[in-house]
């Protein structure tokens, strides 16, 4: 009789197993899904803010000319808003010229104020150079106006209508910016 | 998911030339950019060079004109050329994947400049 109930115990306790497993697996499943949902919610997404509306820039960009921009909401030190922007598939802002420069500046103006915002300007820390992240030179006109008196790595940032240089471990708002879809019509 | 695999690390002297790749697999559509990061022993990993799926680059100031980063689209792989190489930049060299929702890190791959 004990014998029995031995032998009934370790099956149900068998059983229980199994059913853990199962329910182990089918968590996992779900999360699998869960991920792969939020997948295709952001590749349609992009997809259908650019493509369907046929829009050259996403929801939330300005476009000027070949180029998108993003202007943050959110604050950080400038490596962080360089990651933030390389996970929207482009890069802080790079300025070439100073007619982009004014687009740029009367868009903030009209958007937020004066605040300050990171672009994709950092000085070399041996020889002084001020280099763009593609590794072009910025225009003589577009230097940041002040030398930054830090110890730490230098970086530029955009107030009102300045160029302007800042320890890049400051926070501070960024810009992004990614090249516009062409039409295909 | 989506899976990095690195390749092309080695032991080469100061002065010269290696070349890394990166090949992706899996829910690639998921991703945006693709960057090198690297980490020297006791210090932090830090970002090297990435390029966006349009093509825009990025570079660490301390490897401005020396490498070069590149992607093949065919070959969903991402390569980093780097040149006239420094002791200072012995370390594992790591791709990641930047998407939207999650980043993607691959093994990593030792780079190891002798003097």
């Known amino acids: 009789k004990l014998l029995q109930v031995s032998t009934i115990a370790m099956q149900q306790q068998e059983k229980l197993i199994q059913q853990e497993r199962a329910l182990l697996n089918f968590t996992e499943w779900k999360r699998s899904c869960a991920l792969q949902m939020k997948y295709c919610q952001a590749f349609m997404q992009n997809s259908l803010s650019s493509a369907h509306n046929s829009s050259p820039c996403p929801n939330n960009w300005i476009q000027n000319r070949e180029s998108c921009y993003y202007v943050s909401e959110i604050w950080s030190i400038w490596h962080t808003s360089q990651e933030n922007c390389l996970k929207e598939g482009s890069t802080l802002l790079q300025i070439e010229s100073k007619e982009e420069m004014d687009f740029i500046t009367g868009s903030l103006r009209k958007i937020k104020g004066s605040y300050d915002y990171w672009v994709g300007l950092s000085q070399d820390g041996h020889s002084g150079r001020w280099l763009w992240q593609d590794g072009s030179s910025p225009s003589p006109g577009l230097l940041p106006a002040e030398r930054s008196q830090s110890a730490n790595q230098v970086c530029g940032y955009v107030k009102s209508n300045s160029l302007l240089s800042s320890n890049c471990s400051t926070w501070k708002y960024f810009i992004c910016e990614k090249y516009a879809l062409r039409s295909s019509v | 998911q989506v899976q990095l695999q690195e390749s092309g690390g080695g032991l080469v002297q100061a002065g010269g030339s290696l070349r890394l790749s990166c090949a992706a697999s899996?829910?690639?559509?998921?991703?945006?950019?693709m960057g090198w990061y690297r980490q020297a022993p006791g210090k932090q990993r830090e970002l090297v060079a990435a390029?966006?799926?349009?093509?825009?680059?990025t570079y660490a100031d301390s490897v401005k004109g020396r490498f070069t980063i590149s992607r093949d689209n065919a070959k969903n792989t991402v390569y980093l050329q780097m040149d006239s190489l420094k002791p200072e930049d012995t370390a594992v060299y790591y791709c990641?994947?930047?998407?939207?929702?999650?980043?993607?890190w691959g093994q990593g791959t030792q780079v190891t400049v002798s003097s």
């Open positions: 990641k994947g930047f998407s939207l929702t999650d980043d993607y």
């Open positions: 899996g829910s690639i559509f998921s991703i945006n950019s």
């Open positions: 390029i966006t799926n349009g093509g825009r680059t």
